[in-house]
Interface confidence: medium
């Protein structure tokens, strides 16, 4: 018996086609992925082949205006049109509260939303009883396959859960509903979840009872043979693991964006033992039609966003000094607003020893684009943030030792005065710097702000510690030529939309008024 | 249907070399591997090897290292076995085997078999 | 490289007989063992694959089992179309088969 697993993963609200970078449109006939152009590669595999799932492995919510506008009934809406047999929950989801998962998404959608390691308590387990669960049984054909979904347990240091949802380790909380799946007679299991490739691997090795795992997360691109856009794999699609009792699991994931759909083909015995699978993400690029009434759906909807990205979202009583002679050369307080936002996005107090889990944000000066005049009426929109911030990036959540920060900053300054975009802005962090001495060593003085304090203070930097850093995706991946930061991090989980932060930030914030105060000296 | 069509006898002389094909349709070609087995007249059967036909990549039962050559066309969905130097002890009869799914190598779809007599 | 010795070579019966054959390989080869069944003139036919599942559409009369390195396979009642030679194979490193077992009527 033979089933085909279409999937995608971190869409992260890319509705409307993107470029081959995932950001904005521009050229559209090198645009890519957006959800008119799926529904075209769907219909067309599920016209041609019996036993089709549409699986979703979360983070759908998050990343472009779309959700800062609709906040998820976008997500609904869409993804119920183009028939998703299941969804797992993402770490951003959460992004609005459990209430900005329950209304627009948990009780619009017509699909299941599962995630076995969600455990809610008090008077929230009554409110969301039902609207998500821990495994589905679906019918596909004259079979039945399992799907059972999982989240990241680190979702409470990356999103907002609230208090009332406990993430369990994923092992531990998959294996009993898989037992209870084999003791249903379902013998075909899918893990279908967002915890990363690391996790995906795990669940394949160590849960017994899966047959295929289709993750996210990690935006992990896999593919057998030459890839046919920019990513580069990280191993072969399917990947295979051996499990700890000797069975063969593909582990999937498809990139992120929605520029891939994941295509796997399985095959099963009479006895729900896989004893095949191939098939490769298809690059969602133009050569495939997006649906016409599709399309017309997103140009009516599209509206609301032109009309929102003109209003007043706060003001400013000071000028945003993001110039080039500014955030290249010295601390500007654009660089200290955006940074003040990132922290302020990521407060999260979940242990009582820490008034915070990170304090620390790095912000390279080439990312920030253009000032803001306080002159128009101190008028703040979503499109001067664009302007400031037109890259559509992410601010990202980064473990680092000490050691790769002070490389870190060292690069920040190695090459200073020529303009370049190293040069870093800083939140929770005080620098001086000697330009004096040679390159390599002009970091004469790295104060960092505790987090496991009740009166936060500024402690020198210790080499050995590992410390949480808010950053743009940019850097975490390498970027203006911090290579040490992409080869030497611990740990990285991919945050929320960049404008997102800033607009969120100056809406609590109403009047906003940064100032030039010190955090980046020479001496 | 899966259905593999192997090439017609072959009769050979000491030294030399002979190519058997196997034509492959029914299924999505590059997604298994082609297996080869020899079976020598009323003997049990021996592995010779397997190619994958998306990339081209090929393992061999050391026996069998540098008497046969195993490669694909992709185009035609052809499997071809090459075997040089020839001796008697070649004659036999060479199956081409793809196996139930791609994970193990239990052959569920096998050729119809070429026979090889080598003989002066 | 892995050995497969069947036992018995030779095996005389008349239909309606229960049958035994065993497979002992040189070291432990988990449970990837096979069995094939291969009459006169044609190739042979999977029966058996991970030593106790039946492929498709073969008969309920065929069954295997084992783990390790002694892996049994057995027609429950023999009948006239099943003469033939029956061979494990095993998979779990490279690949091998045995030398095959021979059915015939008494």
């Known amino acids: 018996w033979e089933l085909t697993i279409l999937h995608t993963n971190d869409v992260h609200s890319r509705l409307e086609q993107t470029s081959e970078d995932s950001s904005k449109c521009v050229n559209a006939s090198r645009c890519m992925g957006g959800v008119a152009r799926l529904f075209t590669k769907v219909q067309s595999i599920r016209a041609e082949e019996p036993n089709v799932l549409l699986l979703d492995a979360g983070d759908q919510y998050q990343g472009t205006i779309w959700f800062t506008v609709y906040k998820g009934a976008e997500v609904a809406h869409f993804m119920n049109i183009l028939g998703y047999d299941a969804m797992a929950l993402g770490n951003h989801e959460f992004d609005n509260g459990v209430e900005g998962l329950i209304e627009p998404l948990l009780k619009e959608a017509k699909f299941p939303i599962l995630s076995a390691n969600i455990k809610a308590k008090g008077p929230l387990a009554s409110q969301i009883s039902g609207l998500y669960l821990p495994y589905k049984v679906l019918p596909v054909g004259d079979e039945v396959v399992g799907i059972v979904g999982y989240t990241s347990k680190e979702t409470p240091f990356l999103s907002n859960p609230g208090t009332n949802l406990v993430f369990e380790d994923e092992i531990t909380a998959l294996q009993p509903e898989v037992d209870k799946l084999k003791t249903l007679n379902v013998n075909k299991i899918i893990a279908l979840g967002h915890s990363g490739f690391e996790m995906d691997k795990l669940i394949a090795q160590k849960v017994r009872g899966v047959d295929v795992v289709v993750g996210g997360h990690s935006n992990t691109f896999l593919y057998t043979g030459n890839p046919p856009s920019k990513e580069v794999p990280a191993g072969k699609y399917p990947f295979i693991v051996t499990s700890d009792d000797g069975r063969k699991v593909p582990v999937v994931q498809a990139y992120a964006f929605g520029k891939y759909l994941g295509y796997l083909k399985i095959e099963f015995d009479e006895r729900g033992n896989v004893i095949s699978s191939h098939g490769n993400p298809i690059l969602l690029n133009s050569s495939i039609p997006e649906d016409p009434s599709i399309k017309a759906d997103i140009n009516k909807w599209r509206i609301k966003l032109d009309n929102y990205s003109t209003q007043e979202l706060g003001k400013t009583i000071v000028y945003l000094d993001g110039s080039s002679q500014s955030c290249r050369f010295r601390e500007c307080n654009m660089g200290n607003l955006i940074c003040d936002a990132m922290i302020n996005n990521n407060l999260r107090h979940t242990d009582e020893m820490f008034w915070n889990h990170v304090s620390m944000c790095i912000l390279n000066g080439g990312g920030i684009r253009s000032p803001i005049d306080e002159r128009n009426n101190g008028t703040i929109t979503w499109e001067n943030l664009a302007a400031v911030l037109p890259f559509g990036g992410t601010f990202d959540l980064v473990q680092l030792k000490g050691s790769t920060l002070k490389k870190a900053f060292e690069h920040s300054v190695h090459r200073y005065g020529q303009s370049t975009g190293e040069f870093l802005q800083v939140g929770g962090i005080h620098v001086v710097y000697d330009l004096s001495r040679k390159p390599g060593d002009r970091v004469v003085k790295l104060d960092v702000l505790c987090t496991k304090c009740r009166v936060p203070s500024y402690d020198p930097l210790k080499m050995d510690e590992v410390y949480k850093v808010i950053l743009p995706n940019f850097l975490a991946n390498g970027g203006d030529g911090f290579q040490m930061i992409k080869d030497e991090l611990l740990r990285h989980d991919s945050g929320d939309q960049d404008i997102n932060v800033v607009s969120t930030y100056i809406s609590k914030m109403k009047v906003i008024y940064p100032a030039v105060e010190g955090r980046i000296k020479f001496s | 249907e899966v259905q593999l069509q192997q090439s017609g006898p072959e009769l050979v002389k000491p030294g030399a070399s002979v190519k058997v094909s196997c034509k492959a349709s029914?299924?999505?070609?590059?997604?298994?591997?082609m297996n080869w087995v020899k079976q020598s007249h009323g003997k049990s059967l021996d592995w010779i090897g397997y190619?994958?036909?998306?990339?081209?990549?090929?393992s061999y039962n050391l026996t069998f290292k540098g008497k046969a050559t195993l490669t694909v066309d992709k185009s035609s969905t052809t499997a071809y076995m090459h075997l040089n130097s020839l001796t008697s002890e070649d004659s036999a009869v060479y199956y081409c085997?793809?196996?139930?799914?791609?994970?193990?190598?239990?052959?569920?779809?096998w050729g119809q078999g070429t026979l090889v007599t080598v003989s002066a | 490289s892995i050995v497969m010795t069947p036992t018995p070579k030779f095996l005389l019966v008349s239909a309606g007989d229960r049958v035994t054959i065993t497979c002992k390989a040189s070291q432990s080869v988990s449970n990837d063992v096979a069995w094939y069944q291969q009459k006169p003139g044609q190739s042979p036919k999977l029966l058996i694959y991970?030593?106790?599942t039946r492929y498709t559409g073969v008969p309920d009369r065929f069954t295997g089992s084992g783990y390790g390195t002694d892996f049994t396979f057995t027609i429950s009642t023999v009948q006239a179309e099943d003469l033939a030679v029956y061979f494990c194979?095993?998979?779990?490193?490279?690949?091998?088969f045995g030398a095959g077992t021979k059915l015939e009527l008494k």
């Open positions: 991970y030593a106790s």
């Open positions: 029914g299924y999505a070609f590059a997604s298994y591997n």
């Open positions: 085997a793809r196996g139930y799914g791609n994970y193990k190598a239990w052959f569920a779809y």
């Open positions: 194979q095993q998979d779990y490193s490279s690949l091998t």
């Open positions: 190619i994958d036909p998306y990339n081209g990549g090929s």
